[in-house]
């Protein structure tokens, strides 16, 4: 399938959104910060087929969403932003849905590449750690909030090359 | 193609103050930081400070808290940086930068510079 | 502040050669996995370009012959081959705390 111009522009907008949700100044989390092992090599469009591009893709943005539906999450960010934020998420969600159907019947390839599912929930368990780790205090989710951006512009330069592989 | 367009050439009395001003384009404006860097001639480079220009919020070098303010409009994607009460130690090229790679903080484009020149 | 100290002030290599130029941090600029030192390369009458984010990752569209490395207080950058056009004075500058600084130079010539 074509990934849709509108699902790139769907990202920028979470990236907007998500910028836009910062609550405290990030200069006082300096000591903060974390390395949280972004699988950078999952993003890379080259080395998958499609299908399975597609689903690395949908795994980051389903644990995304997950984990900005806690309580937790709740409770850290403006709510007004943080539904907009989750809604954005939700439709790119059914975008790609609907993409693994069409696609599903033109490849050969099996539908998931589980070692890089696997890679993209551990990612996403060591963000959960290092929230419950740091009590979920104000500059432990600012510190995931630029890395969650961080993750999800890599995700957007895959949609790029993906898009340029058609 | 991302863009900082800075303002030219100024020439200042000591004791006066000058307002610089960066232009940004290619990107979103609101959602990075933008930074400020000093170069004396000759010399290295010295952070002066960073703002966010989607809600204004600022983070200084203690050195220039008194020396340099940031602000910025967002509708007309522009940063300023004004610096008050200049002596010929503040005669330098400034560079407007942006923000990179979130909280590694970082600098990938830079504005061509604005010279600031204090002579009586 | 963290001071950052760069050596040697300058050097002269012969074209594909190796530069290597040291940055000593006062304090340590590394934290729970990452090293929060970048390095910069700015040529006569233009502005600085970053090459080396995080003490080792190159920066895109920056040639392979760069690369970086080091940890806590001592980073490298290294040049291999050199070329003509890497004349230029290069800065480390890192952001492990405010106020984040810059290294005072190193000026590579090519002979």
């Known amino acids: 399938c074509d990934l849709p111009q509108t699902h790139s522009l769907g990202n920028r907008r979470a990236l907007i959104l998500l910028a836009q949700m910062g609550r405290i100044s990030p200069f006082s989390c300096l000591k903060d910060r974390h390395d949280f092992g972004l699988p950078q090599e999952e993003f890379d469009g080259n080395q998958f087929q499609k299908t399975q591009a597609i689903s690395v893709l949908h795994e980051m943005i389903q644990q995304t969403f997950n984990l900005f539906s806690t309580e937790d999450s709740s409770a850290a960010w403006e709510q007004r932003l943080l539904e907009k934020f989750s809604t954005e998420l939700y439709q790119q969600l059914n975008n790609l849905e609907a993409c693994v159907i069409q696609e599903v019947g033109m490849e050969e390839t099996p539908l998931m590449n589980e070692d890089s599912i696997l890679a993209v929930r551990k990612y996403f368990q060591r963000i959960t750690l290092y929230l419950t780790e740091k009590k979920y205090s104000p500059c432990a989710w600012e510190v995931v909030r630029a890395e969650i951006m961080r993750s999800l512009s890599f995700s957007t330069n895959l949609q790029k090359r993906l898009r340029r592989k058609d | 193609q991302v863009q900082l367009q800075e303002s030219g050439t100024v020439l200042a009395r000591p004791g006066a103050s000058v307002k610089m001003s960066c232009k940004a384009s290619g990107y979103s404006f609101t959602t990075y930081w933008m930074h400020w860097v000093k170069q004396r001639p000759g010399q290295g480079l010295e952070w002066i400070g960073v703002?966010?220009?989607?809600?204004?919020?600022?983070t200084y070098n203690q050195k220039f808290k008194d020396k340099a303010k940031l602000t910025a409009v967002t509708s007309a994607n522009t940063a300023y940086m004004e610096l008050s009460s200049l002596t010929n130690e503040d005669s330098a090229v400034y560079f407007c930068?942006?923000?990179?790679?979130?909280?590694?903080?970082?600098?990938?484009?830079w504005g061509q510079g604005t010279t600031v020149t204090v002579s009586s | 502040d963290i001071v950052l100290t760069q050596s040697p002030a300058s050097l002269a290599v012969s074209l594909g050669q190796r530069a290597t130029i040291s940055c000593r941090a006062s304090k340590s600029v590394s934290t729970s996995g990452h090293s929060y030192m970048h390095w910069y390369q700015q040529k006569p009458g233009q502005t600085p370009k970053l090459l080396i984010y995080?003490?080792?990752n190159l920066e895109s569209g920056v040639p392979a012959r760069f690369s970086g490395s080091g940890s806590g207080t001592d980073f490298t950058l290294n040049i291999h081959p050199v070329e003509e056009e890497d004349a230029a004075t290069y800065y480390c500058q890192h952001s492990g705390e405010l106020p984040f600084t810059f290294g005072s130079g190193t000026k590579l010539e090519i002979k």
């Open positions: 995080l003490a080792s």
């Open positions: 703002i966010y220009p989607g809600n204004g919020d600022t």
């Open positions: 930068t942006r923000n990179y790679k979130y909280d590694y903080y970082t600098m990938d484009y």
